[in-house]
Amino acid sequence: IWSAVFLNSLFNQEVQIPLTESYCGPCPKNWICYKNNCYQFFNESKNWYESQASCMSQNASLLKVYSKEDQDLLKLVKSYHWMGLVHIPTNGSWQWEDGSILSPNLLTIIEMQKGDCALYASSFKGYIENCSIPNTYICMQRTV
Amino acid sequence: IWSAVFLNSLFNQEVQIPLTESYCGPCPKNWICYKNNCYQFFNESKNWYESQASCMSQNASLLKVYSKEDQDLLKLVKSYHWMGLVHIPTNGSWQWEDGSILSPNLLTIIEMQKGDCALYASSFKGYIENCSIPNTYICMQRTV
C-alpha cells in the first residue's frame, strides 16, 4: 500500500490507487502502453528501411509480434503497417530485426506480392510486401 | 532525476529512465494506457445498457470522445463498439453518460439505423444503433 500512496503523491494523484490498478511503462512520452510494452503508430509513409531507422532513432524497433495474449490489442488495429519482420531468401525463413525466427501460430503470412518485408494487419496477419514501398509503421519498445 | 531513479527501483528497473520517458496511469490491470487515460476493448457482445453496467462494475464508463488530439489512438480502431453516447429525444441532442453534450467536430454521426445509442467506428465516426442490439464495447477510465 505504501508504494501506491507514494506513487499517488509522486504523480500528483489525490486518490489512493486501488491495488488492482497499476502504472504502465516507462514509455516514450505519448506512446501507448499495454502490458508494459510501448507502442506508437506513425502516420507518415516510409519504406521499410526508413521505418526501421525512425524506430531506432527513438530507441525502439519496428513491431515484433511475440505473443497473441500479451499483444491482443493488435487484434483491433485498422489498416496496414510495417512491422519488423523480414524474409531471409537464403533459408526461406521469416525473422525479426533482433534475429529471432517467427514462431508458428503467431502470424498468418499472406503472399499476394513479391517482397521480403511484411505489413502487419489486424487479427495477426502479415502481408508480404516489397520493402521499398512506402507505408505507415508501428514502433515498439519493450520495457525492461 | 531522483524520482525517475526511485521509480526504477520501485518497478525493478535496472536502467535509469530517460527524462523523455514516463509512466502512464494508474489503470486497471492489463488495460491500455494512453496519454494518462485507460481503455479496454471488450470482445463479448452486450447491448448498450449491459455494456454500460459492465464498465461501471470496473469503475469505468463507456468510451467518451472528448479530444481528437488526446485520443488519436482511436483513429486506428477496427470494427464497431458501443461508446457512452446517447440521444436525448426530448431536445434532440447527443450526450455522454456524464450528462455533457457532444461537442461539435469531434464525431461524425452516421444515421444508418433508428436508435438512441451510438457505436464508435474508426476515424471518429459514430453510427446510430438501436440500444438493445448486442455489440462489443469500449470502457474508459480517466485518470485523476
Epitope: W94, Q113, K125 | -
Partner: antibody
Amino acid sequence: EVQLVQSGAEVKKPGATVKISCKVSGYTFTDYYMHWVQQAPGKGLEWMGLVDPEDGETIYAEKFQGRVTITADTSTDTAYMELSSLRSEDTAVYYCARGIARYPNGPGGLLYYYYYGMDVWGQGTTVTVSS
Amino acid sequence: SYELTQPLSVSVALGQTARITCGGNNIGSKNVHWYQQKPGQAPVLVIYRDSNRPSGIPERFSGSNSGNTATLTISRAQAGDEADYYCQVWDSFAFVFGGGTKLTVL
C-alpha cells in the same frame, strides 16, 4: 467438382439494397478467400472486395467502401455481397470468385496463404437498377 | 491509385502468335495474373504469377513480366481464343484489373 453457384437475377429501384449469395461446393470453404467482381454492360472487370471466411475479415475497394458489405456463413458454405444505396450505374453482372489459398504448413511450419489468381468463378448475377 | 494499361484490341492471323501487353509503373515487381473472358461467360484464369498456367490451360498460353510491361503470349492462335483478356495485380490492398483487350483471330 469445385462449384460456385450464385443467386438469381435481381431488379431493384434506385436507393434500394441488393444481397447476392454465392454457395460453394467441392472444397473446404474456409481454405480460400472469396472475392466479388463487378462488370457493367460492355465494360471491364472491377474488383469490389474480399472476405476471409475463416475469420470474417474483409478488404474493400475504395470505390465501393461504405456501400458494400461482404460476409461469409461457414455453416452453409455461402458468401454474400450486399450493395446499398443503389444507382443506375450499379446495373451490372456481379461475380463471386475464389482466390488466396490456405496452406497450413508453409515454410517454417507457418500458416501461409498464397494468391494464385481467381481460379474458380460463379456464373454471375445480373442486377438491374431502374426506377 | 495504380493503373494498368492494355491496348483496346489486338488482331492475329489464325495460327500466328498474339501478344497482349499490360503496362504499369514497375509492374515487374508485382505478380501479374491474366484472365480470358468470352461473351456471356464468366472469366477464366489463364496465367497466374507472371508465367504459370493453371491445369487445363493449353501450353500455347504463356506470360512474362519485367520492367514496366507484362505480356500474355498466345502462340498458334485458334478461333476459340477470340475473347477479352484482362491483366490483374495487387496494389495498396486492392486488386486492380487492366481495362481489357479484345483479341480478334482473323
